[in-house]
Interface confidence: low
């Protein structure tokens, strides 16, 4: 008779719901501080009065909103991912920059370049980067379009990264591409400006290779005419990274115990 | 003081390892029978003497071996996926079939057709299909190659499904593509023969579109000469499905309680 | 699944996700998190009743595995299945920071 | 991770994956599964020690969350994290069947 043994392992004891709620709340108090690596809540003495800056709210909203193509957070998470990630964003270099000149005439592609010094300011070391997403605001689209994303590789070569099938839509929608590996590479290299290309998917026999989709930040009509930029909603890189000061704790703690 | 309450929720009691092992073993006894929807172990009275048939062992090995491109089983699983899935395989239609004639001359693609009557024999209803993988034995490859998989859609059109970057390799390697949705479509439709196309990835500006990779089942050299088939290792569909008799239990039990 | 859709609308006594909204100011006495003001943390609670016996009448317990002990554990436990992250805004000195905290919101539970 | 690489080579007393090989014939008395003859089922065992208190000395317990209560549960529990399927061959009458059983092999555990 294993009666006593069974009791040892039983999980179906009556548990007071209020006690559990209280314990959960207290556990969350510790969890949040722990994820931020804070021993106690930060002092609010120097916090400027008034509402949060617009740019901060925009960044917060970008992080909060799940967008097309972004996968739900994977579970399980590596140990380093337990800790909070600082979120920053780096906007695409404006299109009057000379880098765009030699890419103007293509009907099947648009180009997006980023200043690596801005990236390095946000993420000082490649190893700190936990996730990088390229976010594009896609405007209305009349027909289904299959697009591909490429990374600028060497002088005139492009490396395929991923693809997406875009359904027709009457309303604007944010698209997200995971470009963590690419941005990590950029942070490791010495280049000043790095870029992506969004192209129509070209099959080996098809000849209709026009990029139909409109991305905010590039004027519609000829794909080559990269003139007007629509404010903050031009393409950007959303970066999630471990802050440098927090990373030092993680260095040698490769295992959880 | 919540001392007693704490004890209620404590998980750090000393537990006898042997008892836990015994409980785990007994739980697995029930789990296996439950997953197979068997009330008791099946009778062995009619089992033929001698070793298992070659084809059964080959199928078992195909299932056991994790192959390139196949993701580890996702967790969480939907309720229906708790139950065991019967595994079958359907080989590609041999290449002397007339269906291949009109696709012979391409250097950028190979074609693989399947008999839907064989698929229906293995999986009588689309809803029973839990997973379908297209498995290809890729032979040695000298250079990196980016390939794309398409589904035959209508008379002469092909629908893009997925892509894969194949690294150079001196040894043969099985590739796996998840084609569950496509096979489910085929089972719902009336067609007799359905197919896939494996093509070199063609970018909008590149003109070098030759498929370099050799897939077992198609002779090397000219991609167009689809003559010799190398035994059981030609492309096949690996199907995992709920057996019809087991599915009836699942019909009305939409929720676990 | 034992998710918010099912559990919040039922009186399920066994393992299920339970509603818990945390207001940073009221529940934790914190004013330092500027956004959001609180969040639906939720939690998992409820037994995973599972009959274990050395006798051979397995048919009795077979139906229970899928519900209460799908992983054939020696002592199944009600734990989170699907989790979601939470972004927050707070200040370090005069500098506002946006940070993402992983696995903060429980969307569904399972007996494991 | 609390996986087979770490747990099988350590004397970890806390939550970890533990070795368990099941021989269908010896352990279950079954001759009806023709392939495999047995498998490494493994299991999760060990406490997820976690100090909960109403006092305000949080700094003491902060370091513990990642190890023992990453999900901020009221009562963390040692459960499977990564699972793998098991294919089997058995006969129904004269007909051999290959079936895949999901989530049969425990590869790693976590406090959840």
């Amino acid at each position: 008779d294993y009666k006593d043994d069974d009791d040892k392992l039983s999980t179906s004891k009556t548990i007071d719901m209020e006690l559990v709620k209280r314990k959960r709340i207290e556990a969350i108090r510790g969890q949040i501080l722990s994820k931020l690596r804070l021993a106690s809540p930060p002092s609010q003495g120097e916090v400027p009065p008034g509402p949060l800056p617009e740019a901060v709210l925009a960044l917060y909203n970008s992080t909060r909103d799940r967008v097309a193509g972004e996968s739900a957070e994977p579970e399980p998470e590596p140990e380093a991912d337990y800790y909070a990630k600082e979120v920053t964003r780096v906007l695409m270099v404006e299109t009057h920059n000379e880098i765009y000149d030699k890419f103007k005439q293509s009907t099947h592609s648009i180009y997006m370049f980023f200043n690596t010094s801005e990236l390095r300011e946000a993420v000082p070391e490649p190893v700190l980067l936990s996730r990088a997403e390229l976010r594009l605001l896609r405007l209305k689209l009349k027909v289904e379009q299959h697009v591909e994303l490429y990374q600028k590789y060497s002088n005139n070569s492009w490396r395929y990264l991923s693809n997406r099938l875009l359904a027709p839509s009457d309303s604007p929608e944010w698209l997200s591409f995971d470009v963590t590996g690419v941005v990590r590479q950029w942070l490791s290299r010495g280049g000043e400006i790095e870029g992506f290309r969004l192209s129509a998917h070209c099959s080996c026999d098809s000849r209709d290779n026009t990029l139909q989709v409109d991305i905010n930040g590039f004027t519609t009509g000829r794909r080559g005419d990269l003139a007007t930029i629509h404010g903050m909603n031009r393409p950007f890189l959303l970066l999630m990274a471990t802050p440098l000061e927090r990373a030092q704790h993680l260095q040698s703690s490769r295992h959880r115990r | 003081d919540y001392k007693d309450d704490d004890d209620k929720l404590s998980t750090s009691k000393t537990i006898d390892m042997e008892l836990v092992k015994r409980k785990r073993i007994e739980a697995i006894r029930g789990q296996i029978l439950s997953k197979l929807r068997l009330a008791s172990p099946p009778s062995q009275g009619e089992v033929p003497p001698g070793p298992l048939p070659e084809a059964v062992l080959a199928l078992y090995n195909s299932t056991r071996d994790r192959v390139a491109g196949e993701s580890a089983e996702p967790e969480p699983e939907p309720e229906a996926d708790y139950y065991a899935k019967e595994v079958t395989r359907v080989l590609m239609v041999e290449t002397h079939n007339e269906i291949y004639d009109k696709f012979k001359q391409s250097t950028h693609s190979i074609y693989m057709f399947f008999n839907t009557s064989e698929l229906r024999e293995a999986v009588p209803e689309p809803v029973l299909l839990s997973r379908a993988e297209l498995r290809l034995l890729r032979l040695k490859l000298k250079v990196e190659q980016h390939v794309e998989l398409y589904q035959k859609y209508s008379n002469n059109s092909w629908r893009y499904l997925s892509n894969r970057l194949l690294a150079p390799s001196d040894s043969p390697e099985w590739l796996s593509f998840d084609v569950t949705g496509v096979v489910r479509q085929w089972l719902s439709r009336g067609g007799e023969i359905e197919g896939f196309r494996l093509s070199a990835h063609c970018s909008c500006d590149s003109r070098d579109n030759t498929l370099q990779v050799d897939i077992n089942g198609f002779t090397t050299g000219r991609r167009g000469d689809l003559a010799t088939i190398h035994g059981m290792n030609r492309p096949f569909l690996l199907l995992m499905a709920t057996p019809l008799e087991r599915a009836q239990h699942l019909q009305s039990s939409r929720h676990r309680r | 699944a034992l998710d918010t859709n099912y559990c919040f609308s039922s009186t399920e006594k066994n393992c299920c996700v339970r509603q818990l909204y945390i207001d940073f100011r009221k529940d934790l006495g914190w004013k330092w998190i500027h956004e959001p003001k609180g969040y639906h943390a939720n939690f998992c609670l409820g037994p995973c009743p599972y009959i274990w016996s050395l006798d051979t009448q397995y048919s009795k317990v077979l139906a229970l595995y899928n519900q209460h002990n799908p992983g054939a554990s020696a002592a199944p436990c009600c734990v989170p299945q699907a989790l979601e992250p939470l972004p927050i805004v707070y200040y370090v000195g005069r500098k506002p920071k946006v940070e993402q905290l992983s696995n903060m919101i429980v969307r569904s539970c399972k007996c494991s | 991770a609390l996986d087979t690489n770490y747990c099988f080579s350590s004397t970890e007393k806390n939550c970890c994956v533990r070795q368990l090989y099941i021989d269908f014939r010896k352990d279950l008395g079954w001759k009806w599964i023709h392939e495999p003859k047995g498998y490494h089922a493994n299991f999760c065992l060990g406490p997820c020690p976690y100090i909960w208190s109403l006092d305000t000395q949080y700094s003491k317990v902060l370091a513990l969350y990642n190890q023992h209560n990453p999900g901020a549960s009221a009562a963390p529990c040692c459960v499977p994290q990564a699972l793998e399927p098991l294919p089997i061959v058995y006969y129904v009458g004269r007909k051999p069947k290959v079936e895949q059983l999901s989530n049969m092999i425990v590869r790693s555990c976590k406090c959840s």
């Epitope: 704790h249 993680l250 260095q251 040698s252 703690s253 490769r254 295992h255 959880r256 115990r257 | 750090s12 | - | 770490y6 080579s9 350590s10 004397t11 007393k13 806390n14 406490p47 020690p49 976690y50 100090i51 003491k60 317990v61 370091a63 513990l64 190890q67 023992h68």
Partner: antibody, heavy 122, light 108 residues
Framework: QVQLVESGGGVVQPGRSLRLSCAAS????????MNWIRQPPGKGLEWIGY???????YRSNWARGRFTISRDNSKNTLYLQMNSLRAEDTAVYYC????????????????WGQGTLVTVSS | DIQMTQSPSSLSASVGDRVTITCQAS??????EAWYQQKPGQPPKLLIY???TLESGVPSRFSGSGSGTDFTLTISSLQPEDFATYYC??????????FGQGTKVEIK
């Protein structure tokens, strides 16, 4: 099996420095908290300090000025650097693996080395 | 600083005797208390942690109790191999890791 072997002890003159090492084997060293404890001849145990996996250290108040604890996870070795030694530092020095079955029990000495004798004498 | 005061500092007992050693902390340490046994020429060995939890492999004749400031180690029936020095230890945090001065258990 688990082994901790201290070395580097011996006779040293007052005011000089000494570095003790503790070589660990039989367990995943980089995942474990480690402690140094000493025992003067014929006396009781004195906790010197502890180092967590990440390199964070705690030391007894009396040890803070002169004693430094460090570790090299790649070499599976724990170190104790002792400066400005005095006669009262004469003791057997033990390294011990901290235990972590409950929260604060990094400071429960779960497994001890055999110790190395340090004699401070002119 | 926390102080751990052990008593008695030594005791004589016979095989089969019940032996009790006490330890008092200068301030509350909850149940963050451990007991060690040390034999001559050997390092200490952990017997009990969390005031009352027996370390695996330690005979059940050893038991611990107490919380807050007062703790007790009991050997229910002294065996020949139990003659040794016993130390209590506090460990509520990194600033309060302290050992008692020890209790020597000798043969009567």
């Amino acid at each position: 099996q688990v082994q901790l072997v201290e070395s580097g002890g011996g006779v040293v003159q007052p005011g000089r420095s000494l570095r003790l090492s503790c070589a660990a084997s039989g367990f995943h060293f980089s995942n474990e908290a480690m402690n140094w404890i000493r025992q003067p001849p014929g006396k009781g145990l004195e906790w010197i300090g502890y180092i967590y996996t990440s390199g964070t250290t705690y030391r007894s108040n009396w040890a803070r000025g002169r004693f430094t604890i460090s570790r090299d996870n790649s070499k599976n070795t724990l170190y104790l650097q002792m400066n400005s030694l005095r006669a009262e530092d004469t003791a057997v020095y033990y390294c011990a693996r901290g235990w972590h079955i409950f929260g604060h029990q990094y400071w429960v000495m779960h497994f001890w080395g055999q110790g190395t004798l340090v004699t401070v004498s002119s | 600083d926390i102080q751990m005061t052990q008593s008695p500092s030594s005791l004589s007992a016979s095989v089969g005797d019940r032996v009790t050693i006490t330890c008092q902390a200068s301030q509350s340490i909850s149940t963050y208390e451990a007991w060690y046994q040390q034999k001559p020429g050997q390092p200490p060995k952990l017997l009990i942690y969390a005031a009352s939890t027996l370390e695996s492999g330690v005979p059940s004749r050893f038991s611990g109790s107490g919380s807050g400031t007062d703790f007790t180690l009991t050997i229910s029936s002294l065996q020949p191999e139990d003659f040794a020095t016993y130390y209590c230890q506090s460990y509520s945090d990194g600033d309060s890791v302290k050992f008692g001065q020890g209790t020597k258990v000798e043969i009567k």
